[in-house]
């Protein structure tokens, strides 16, 4: 789909439904919501396989805005991810937004809210603390640090990220919202005022990345199934024997 | 990450304009919308325009008509605009980008804000 702003309000709820995302009526104020949902589902359901370094230096908004070259790139729905979002209790009336580990870079100092029901996740108190960065190696090593902020209920001042979770009407309206309808972090988004958790479609890569060929030879290795069972069969069998040389010995003295 | 540099800005005369512009590098495929927001002395940041990658635009009530926010495909640079400007469109204009991973989920970027003054 070169563009979203294009489709019929029919259109684009065709596609949730396509997408198995749970959805309300379809109309101006909650439109930006429904093409959040879907740029967030097409984001996880792209697979794993990162871009060419050569491809990844030319990416621009066109690309990010065609998916019909891309349709390779997508899983098709499955089942679970309509129970996924079922399991977050969404319903027509009302979505939780679970805005796991917000982070907000170089956010100005002092500054109100930015889409509304997002509020200011950090405020600076000083300029070096403005300017200060946050490299995503130091927030995130792996899927497992991110499990662990979920768990840590609040962060300092200077702390990037926090947890956000509230109920908000669909149906809200923008202007009620102080012109901030749309969240843009949720960990949030750059336009957008739909549930954003930060991780609960994520899945985790099934196979461990490969290693350097000898790395882990030792200690990683493991005795396969069909081993251990001849070991306890061999294990069994001596204990037999010794059990029945005890008992002749005990029979026979001499 | 993604990295906002703003351009632009400056000194103008009410009734006259001004462009700014905001160009995104780094992980920019994971960009979802970028939009203009400024904050006034005294006055909490406020929404002036953004641009969502699928197209859709969305204004401030008090901008509308007078500014426009446009995007370079080929740059992933978005423009705002700015005519007819008023004394109280005086500010500094920050540009915000929202993007989506799968391992951090939404995180929000914000550049470093560009002065706008409108002055006799």
């Known amino acids: 789909m070169d563009n979203y702003a294009d489709l019929s309000d029919t259109e684009l709820t065709t596609l949730l439904r396509r997408y198995n995302i749970p959805h309300g009526p379809v109309v101006g104020s909650t439109r930006r919501l429904y093409e959040k949902k879907i740029f967030e589902y097409e984001t996880q359901r792209r697979r794993l396989s990162p871009p060419s370094s050569s491809a990844a230096s030319s990416y621009s908004f066109s690309d990010l805005n065609s998916t019909r070259g891309d349709a390779d790139m997508y899983d098709l729905p499955k089942k679970e991810d309509a129970l996924l979002y079922q399991s977050k209790g969404y319903n027509d009336d009302y979505y939780e937004e679970s805005y796991f580990t917000t982070r907000t870079y170089g956010e100005p100092e002092s500054a109100g809210p930015s889409r509304a029901v997002r509020q200011s996740v950090t405020s600076f108190p000083d300029a070096d603390a403005f300017h200060h960065q946050v490299h995503d190696d130091d927030l995130l090593s792996s899927s497992e640090e991110e499990c662990k902020d979920r768990e840590r209920p609040m962060y300092g001042r200077d702390s990037a990220y926090q947890s956000i979770t509230h109920y908000r009407p669909v149906s809200a309206s923008r202007s009620s919202l102080d012109l901030s309808y749309y969240p843009t972090s949720s960990s949030t988004s750059f336009m957008s005022s739909s549930s954003s958790s930060s991780s609960w479609l994520t899945r985790r890569a099934i196979r461990p990345e490969n290693r350097a060929p000898g790395a882990g030879l030792g200690q990683d290795r493991q005795v396969p199934l069909w081993g251990q069972l001849l070991l306890f069969l061999v294990f069994v069998i001596v204990l037999f024997f010794i059990y029945h040389f005890m008992q002749a010995e005990e029979g026979n003295p001499f | 990450q993604v990295q906002l540099v703003e351009s632009g800005g400056g000194l103008a005369q009410p009734g006259g304009s001004l462009s700014l512009s905001c160009a995104a590098s780094?992980?920019?495929?994971?960009?979802?919308?970028m939009g203009w927001y400024r904050q006034a002395p005294g006055k909490k940041r406020e929404l002036v325009a953004d641009?969502?990658?699928?197209?859709?635009?969305n204004y401030a009530d008090s901008v509308k008509g007078r500014f426009t926010i446009s995007r370079d495909n080929a740059k992933t640079t978005i423009y705002l605009q700015m005519n007819s400007l008023k004394p109280e469109d005086t500010a500094v204009y920050y540009c915000?980008?929202?993007?989506?991973?799968?391992?951090?989920?939404?995180?929000?970027?914000w550049g470093q804000g560009t002065q706008v003054t409108v002055s006799t």
């Open positions: 641009i969502t990658n699928y197209g859709s635009t």
């Open positions: 915000n980008a929202d993007s989506y991973s799968k391992l951090r989920g939404w995180v929000v970027y």
């Open positions: 780094g992980d920019i495929f994971s960009i979802y919308a």
